[in-house]
């Protein structure tokens, strides 16, 4: 396959997330391990200068100096190599130098835990420019355990750089991942480094470590899955949902009824109602009237909205959530005053979100 | 700047297929990969499938797989959509999208594709 | 695949309102969500990416929160010119799935 580069030789674009290297070729520092390096923002009548590494803005720490216009980077590591950018910001303008630092090494390896390189999804860098592999976003790493629900889907990243480019596959608890080893196997995307597994169970616990490899180095991350049960339970409504509300003749009104429910949920928005002036039937139960309930035809069944409310719109409103399990029902009240009595409240057009899975 | 440019509108009959094109132009093809997501009038977006030229992979939504077919041409930057055994519920408009860091950040100007008899 | 579910599926405001609209997903997706703008006859525009960072060009009256499962958009005050329908997108998952998509409309 042909080799490639990210760096263009284009300016940023607007539309271009902040994050795509779009570049001419950047000048390129090298160091060995050990030791100090300066670099000289080359930009003129910088009033205030800001560094970033790799896309992510680079503040002065036990080893990295930031003077005026220089940069210092005393005992140089092969994590400090990267992408670098100077930015002088003027009254009426902007702009950016880069350049590349390569701190040569033997070979990398394991975990580069403190490294905080940018989000990119791979970066190609100057064909004569070899590089061992290297984390390129440890923030999408930082989370090892995940406690998963059976039937999700579980993604694991290990973004990295190198070049050659370097190649990843995965292990389970040690030993090589084949698709055989779970039905429905698994999806690996290459191009973000990533592994997708989908529907999992309680056989896919373990262990899954990424393996990163080109002919300089090799690094790896292990991630711990663990498959969580659900436990059914009877729908859970959240506290002080439907609320109480007011609202003017002619005015509209929204009650919302959060659900929390593992198995799938009825919900029902239920008003009591009188029939030939009686708020009970002969039976002595309640005459009821359902206004909305969830099913193919109901979007949102979460969401009572009520428009051009009259007089007869007040009253108790009662949210009835079932499952196979069980029911749970919370209710509020709704008070509609005339014209003249309008409650004082900010003009707001908010949506409340579907029952959670 | 970057830009993708599909080929034009199609008229189709059921059970025929249907080639659309999306040209890139202002940036590096093979460095993104290409989704391709189609809207039904009046309806929502719906994914299909996507290629990365440089990885060489190539992944298809559930319902059309077998029925689509996503390829690229890393010399003229183009990548194509094939879909076959069309039926009148394939009329929709097709867009070309380039995937970011897996988001989609710039859309082609959408192909119509109507299937009538 | 993972389900996104979209709400309200349409809403009526004024220009100046702040208007939110919401996007949960099936299961959690960690921040890999995305939002679309799209007009009658036009591509869809990346709004927002990451959850809540916002596309380089879009107004800053658009912002993006949440986590997991539950996700927001908001428009802190409606302007003509955002009278739209809007998606959110799941990129977690390889098999993208957008929301059914909120259509706001003029009062």
């Known amino acids: 396959r042909p080799s490639f580069s990210l760096v263009e030789d284009t300016t940023l674009e607007p539309e271009e997330p902040p994050t795509k290297y779009q570049i001419s070729q950047p000048e390129v520092y090298v160091a060995a391990p050990g030791e100090s390096l300066e670099v000289r923002c080359l930009l003129k009548d910088a009033a205030v200068i800001s560094w970033t590494k790799d896309g992510v803005h680079l503040g002065p720490n036990n080893r990295t100096v930031l003077i005026g216009e220089y940069l210092q980077i005393k005992g140089a590591t092969p994590r400090d190599s990267g992408l670098y950018a100077c930015t002088a910001s003027r009254t009426v303008d902007s702009e950016t130098w880069y350049f590349m630092v390569n701190v040569t090494d033997a070979i990398s390896s394991g975990d580069d835990e403190d490294d905080t390189d940018g989000a990119e999804d791979f970066v190609s860098e100057n064909s004569n420019n070899k590089r061992a592999p290297y984390w390129t976003n440890t923030e999408k790493m930082e989370k090892r355990l995940h406690a998963v629900p059976a039937a999700n889907t579980v993604k694991f990243r290990c973004p990295a750089g190198g070049n050659p480019m370097p190649t990843m596959r995965w292990l389970k608890n040690g030993k090589e991942f084949k698709q055989e080893h779970r039905i429905g196997g698994y999806k690996v995307r290459n191009q973000h480094w990533s592994l997708i597994m989908e529907s999992v169970v309680p056989s896919d616990k373990g262990n899954y470590t990424c393996v990163v490899e080109n002919e300089y180095g090799s690094i790896n991350h292990t991630y711990h899955l663990d498959v969580v049960e659900r436990s059914p339970h009877r729908p859970i409504l959240q506290a002080g949902l439907p609320a109480n509300a007011s609202t003017v003749v002619g005015g509209d009104v929204e009650f919302v009824c959060k659900v929390y429910s593992d198995a799938q949920p009825h919900i029902q928005w239920i008003k009591h109602v009188e029939k030939n002036g009686s708020k009970y039937g002969p039976d002595g139960l309640p005459y009821l009237k359902v206004l909305k309930h969830s099913g193919i035809n109901s979007s949102n069944a979460e969401v009572l909205a009520l428009f051009n409310v009259t007089e007869a719109d007040a009253g108790e409103y009662i949210c009835k959530v079932s499952n196979y399990i069980g029911q749970a029902n919370q209710s509020a009240w709704l008070t509609v005053l005339p014209k003249q009595q309008a409650p004082g409240r900010e003009k707001e057009i908010t949506a409340s979100p579907d029952y959670l899975e | 700047q970057v830009q993708l440019v599909q080929s034009g509108a199609e008229v189709k009959k059921p059970g025929s297929s249907v080639k659309v094109s999306c040209k890139a132009s202002?940036?590096?093809?093979?460095?993104?990969?290409i989704s391709w997501v189609r809207q039904a009038p009046g309806q929502g977006l719906e994914w299909m499938g996507y290629?990365?030229?440089?990885?060489?992979?190539?992944h298809y939504a559930q319902k059309f797989q077998g029925r689509v077919t996503i390829t690229a041409d890393e010399s003229t930057s183009t990548a194509y959509m094939e879909l076959s055994s069309l039926r009148s519920e394939d009329t929709a408009v097709y867009y070309c999208?380039?995937?970011?860091?897996?988001?989609?950040?710039?859309w082609g100007q959408g192909t119509l594709v109507t299937v009538s008899s | 695949d993972i389900q996104m579910t979209q709400s309200p599926s349409s809403l009526s405001a004024s220009v100046g309102d702040r208007v939110t609209i919401t996007c949960r997903a099936s299961?959690?997706?960690?921040?890999?969500l995305a939002w679309y703008q799209q007009k009658p006859g036009k591509a869809p525009k990346l709004l927002i990416y990451?959850?809540?960072i916002l596309q380089s060009g879009v107004p800053s009256r658009f912002s993006g929160s949440g986590s997991g499962t539950d996700f927001t958009l908001t428009i802190s005050s409606l302007q003509p010119e955002d009278f739209a329908t809007y998606y959110c997108?799941?990129?977690?998952?390889?098999?993208?799935?957008f929301g059914q998509g909120t259509k706001v409309e003029i009062k």
């Open positions: 290629i990365s030229p440089y990885m060489g992979e190539t």
């Open positions: 990451a959850t809540s």
């Open positions: 997108l799941q990129y977690y998952d390889y098999s993208y799935t």
């Open positions: 299961q959690s997706i960690s921040n890999d």
């Open positions: 202002g940036g590096t093809f093979s460095s993104y990969a």
């Open positions: 999208a380039r995937e970011s860091y897996e988001y989609f950040d710039i």
